[in-house]
């Protein structure tokens, strides 16, 4: 086999014939050196993971819930194209699994028990497996059989295809329990029905079905959907309050030597010629034989999975979680209202050393869990291997596309009221050297750049940000002669001045001496023109405040800020000289754990915050001699956020639409992957 | 109140090693983890390796794979153990768990 053949798995007959055909309508379209088809077939969808994973085929398309079985070990298999409906211009590869209630009823979330419930059918990914996933350890013991524990939390269900005979309660609003549209019940509107006729009080069915049984707003409006946070939002809201998001059709590849972008150019040619209205003769999104052959009938076009995402991050936490629950059936001893150890996500070893002196120190309360770069972190967040991290805006930004929330930000200055008063933020600065008295800020263009690093808000976001308004392109590192900003490509001369050794060099962490704002300034000190970092970087690293040999004899006077209107200015001066105001750095968590990430930790800073004098005999959580570790170390407290806690409110629109200008220039694969989940 | 004694410090050359203890009276100790630190003329008091109390262990980078932490927690002691000692090894080596204050400490001298 050509090394250029994508091996498709078909599960049936009439699979393999429509493979056959389109393995023979792509030879007709395609070059004879562009990719090829060949048909494999299998018993099962199971068959085709594991034909997969062996090497033995290259692609299958599942759905969501087969999608889960891949990624599992020994599989490891990972989604690479998107099945795509609605139009290409608005195309849905994702659905909401929602619970809908009426307006007046007044319960939450966690209030469901003693309810009655309506479902789409037994096994069904939004009407059963999804909500049963996420409330399994809430159902009374014992849990198995799943059905019975089911019908003991609920007072009445329909839950279409149960055994009526085994658990009468699950077919008790609608009598023999139909597996069919018989059933007036039965599958997404037949369970809205459920909810509307007054038979249930929750209908847990997928976004779209309240708009397709309601067309008229103002009936709309009478129906709220639950939120896990134990809130109501309108029905239109379905992105902000859902139970998880699923993917629809996910063609799946191997997560080692997959042909990741053969299947998609592949696929992308395939839609070209036999997508959507394209031919006659051969359409890939039909099924004369049969129904949903090889891809879904009602699919519109593919779509391709950006590089980072894996199966975890694809199918989303929530998703994970209620499969898990559902497939492994564990659940912690009783239930407690009190907190689990918050999970921090630590960089590199040096943050990880100082976070297990916290958790030694914190008696339980923490634990720790290592990354080698700050994207690592966020998405170990996302899929719950982490719970929490301080990050820098630019980083809130990333964090909140992919679903965290603020939940306490660091506060800089010493008040009376600093945990009850988050500040207006920090400034971020271009520092150069006294002694380069040329330099302004409208001619860097072939000097040396220092940068904290790239993603960062003093250090990269807000600096290119206004240089990218001035100069109309990405190309920044051909701008800066050479420079260093850690999360550069290698290759990048952008990474020429980092002082890294072997793989450490250019990776933005503290393995890389130049990283970070005490970094960026040693960078100046030693190597570059012009620093980016924020206004307390000179002061905290001259006049001996820093001991490191590199910097124990700078004086601040030797350093000089350059103005936007080009002018200079004395670093004490940065209130009038300054590139722009910057948003603290913040925690960020799962929504799921926001109280409690909020609980622990203004209980662990009242014990090791600023309010600890003696450092050299105490743990002191916001100290790291000048390496900003965890957190950064002119933090004096975390404080609330009050009403700013998401990504949004708490950035700020100035800052939100910056950041959103500067996206045509990111290398964020995470930020990718993120906005594929969400544009 | 749990105390917490060191010992097993001395003065010893360049490549050589010494085996530190930490004792301490009392019970309950250890059960959040220890932590030996050391504090070198002049300098911070840093951190040297700490062990939970599940058994997990980590080190600063520059004793990483010279210097090993261990417990007996029958014998209600946790010893580090320092191979290939270096002359910036030097200083005084306290152990530490939470709620405990500091002990007197040991000295380490290396010598070149």
């Known amino acids: 086999v050509p090394d250029k053949t994508v091996r498709w798995c078909a599960v049936s007959e009439h699979e393999a014939t429509k493979c056959q055909s389109f393995r023979d309508h792509m030879k007709s379209v395609i070059p004879s050196d562009g990719p090829s088809v060949a048909c494999v077939k299998k018993a099962s969808y199971l068959d085709c993971i594991r034909a997969i994973a062996a090497n033995e085929a290259d692609a299958v398309t599942l759905d969501a819930g087969l999608v889960y079985d891949a990624y599992l070990a020994p599989n490891n298999l990972k989604p690479v194209v998107a099945e795509f409906y609605g139009s290409k211009e608005d195309p849905q590869t994702f659905y909401y699994a929602v619970a809908v209630v009426k307006k007046d009823s007044g319960f939450q979330m966690n209030q469901l028990r003693g309810k009655k419930s309506c479902h789409t059918g037994l096994g069904r990914s939004a009407g059963w497996n999804i909500p049963i996933g996420l409330l399994y350890c809430d159902l009374p013991e014992p849990r198995k059989p799943l059905e019975k524990a089911v019908a003991n939390f609920f007072s009445g269900s329909c839950a279409p295809c149960a055994d009526g005979t085994d658990f009468p309660q699950l077919c008790q609003l609608c009598p023999g329990c139909g597996c069919s549209t018989l059933n007036q019940y039965f599958g997404y509107s037949g369970a809205f029905k459920c909810l509307k006729d007054g038979a249930g009080d929750v209908a847990f069915v997928k976004h779209s079905t309240i708009f397709e049984n309601l067309a008229n707003k103002a009936d709309r409006d009478q129906y709220e959907l639950l939120c896990l946070d134990n809130t109501r939002k309108p029905v239109d809201e379905y992105k902000d309050c859902h139970l998880a998001q699923v993917p629809s059709h996910t063609v799946v590849a191997r997560s080692m030597g997959g042909k990741e972008d053969l299947i998609w150019e592949l696929l992308n040619q395939a839609q070209e010629h036999f997508g959507k209205d394209k031919s006659k003769e051969f359409q890939l999104f039909s099924s004369p034989h049969g129904k949903d052959l090889l891809f879904k009938d009602s699919a519109h076009g593919f779509l391709k999975v950006p590089p980072r995402m894996d199966a975890k991050m694809y199918l989303g936490y929530e998703y994970v979680t209620a499969i898990r629950n559902l497939r492994e059936g564990t659940c912690p001893e009783a239930p407690t209202d009190e907190c689990k150890p918050v999970k921090w996500c630590a960089l590199s070893h040096h943050e990880r050393l100082k976070c297990d002196e916290w958790s030694v120190n914190s008696v339980g309360k923490i634990e720790c869990v290592s990354a080698e770069t700050t994207e690592d972190c966020i998405a170990k967040i996302m899929n719950g291997e982490a719970d929490a991290m301080s990050l820098d805006g630019g980083f809130v930004y990333i964090a909140g596309k992919c679903g965290l929330v603020p939940v306490l930000a660091e506060n800089y200055n010493k008040s009376d009221n600093c945990e009850d008063t988050p500040e207006a933020g920090y400034f971020a600065i271009a520092v150069v050297k006294k002694s380069a008295s040329d330099l302004t800020w409208d001619n860097l263009k072939g000097k040396k750049s220092c940068h904290t690093a790239v993603g960062r808000t003093a250090g990269w976001n807000i600096p290119m940000g206004l240089l990218y308004n001035k100069i109309n392109h990405c190309r920044f590192d051909e701008f800066f002669s050479e420079g260093c900003a850690p999360g550069s490509k290698k290759d990048s001369s952008l990474c020429k001045l980092c002082m890294g050794s072997g793989l450490n060099l250019c990776e933005p962490n503290n393995k890389e001496g130049y990283y970070g704002y005490t970094g960026a300034f040693r960078c100046l000190v030693e190597k570059g023109d012009v620093a980016f970092v924020k206004h307390q970087t000179v002061p905290q690293n001259t006049g001996g405040k820093n001991p490191d040999p590199w910097a124990k004899n700078l004086n601040e006077k030797d350093y000089e800020l350059l103005c936007l209107d080009g002018t200079r200015k004395p670093v004490e001066e940065y209130a009038n000289c300054h590139l722009a105001r910057a948003p603290n750095h913040a925690v960020v968590t799962r929504k799921d754990k926001e109280a409690c990430v909020h609980k622990i930790l203004r209980q662990q800073q009242h014990l090791f915050g600023s309010n600890v004098t003696d450092c050299s005999g105490n743990f002191c959580l916001f100290r790291s001699e000048t390496k900003d570790l965890l957190f950064r170390d002119d933090t004096v407290c975390l404080a609330k956020l009050h009403d700013r806690n998401t990504y949004e409110k708490y950035l700020g629109e100035e800052y939100v639409k910056a950041v959103g200008n500067l996206r045509k220039c990111s290398t964020s694969s995470l930020l990718e992957a993120c906005t594929f989940r969400r544009p | 109140q749990v105390q917490l004694v060191e010992s097993g410090g001395g003065l010893v050359q360049a490549g050589g090693s010494l085996r530190l203890s930490c004792v301490a009276s009392?019970?309950?100790?250890?059960?959040?983890?220890v932590i030996w630190y050391r504090q070198a003329p002049g300098k911070q008091r840093e951190l040297v390796a700490l062990?939970?109390?599940?058994?997990?262990?980590n080190y600063r980078e520059s004793v990483k794979g010279r210097f090993t932490i261990s417990r007996d927690d029958a014998k209600n002691t946790v010893w580090l153990q320092m191979n290939a000692l270096e002359p910036e090894d030097t200083g005084v080596y306290y152990c530490k768990t939470p709620g405990v204050p500091f002990g007197q400490g040991t000295q380490v001298t290396v010598s070149s």
């Open positions: 009392g019970s309950g100790f250890g059960i959040n983890g």
């Open positions: 062990i939970k109390s599940d058994g997990y262990t």
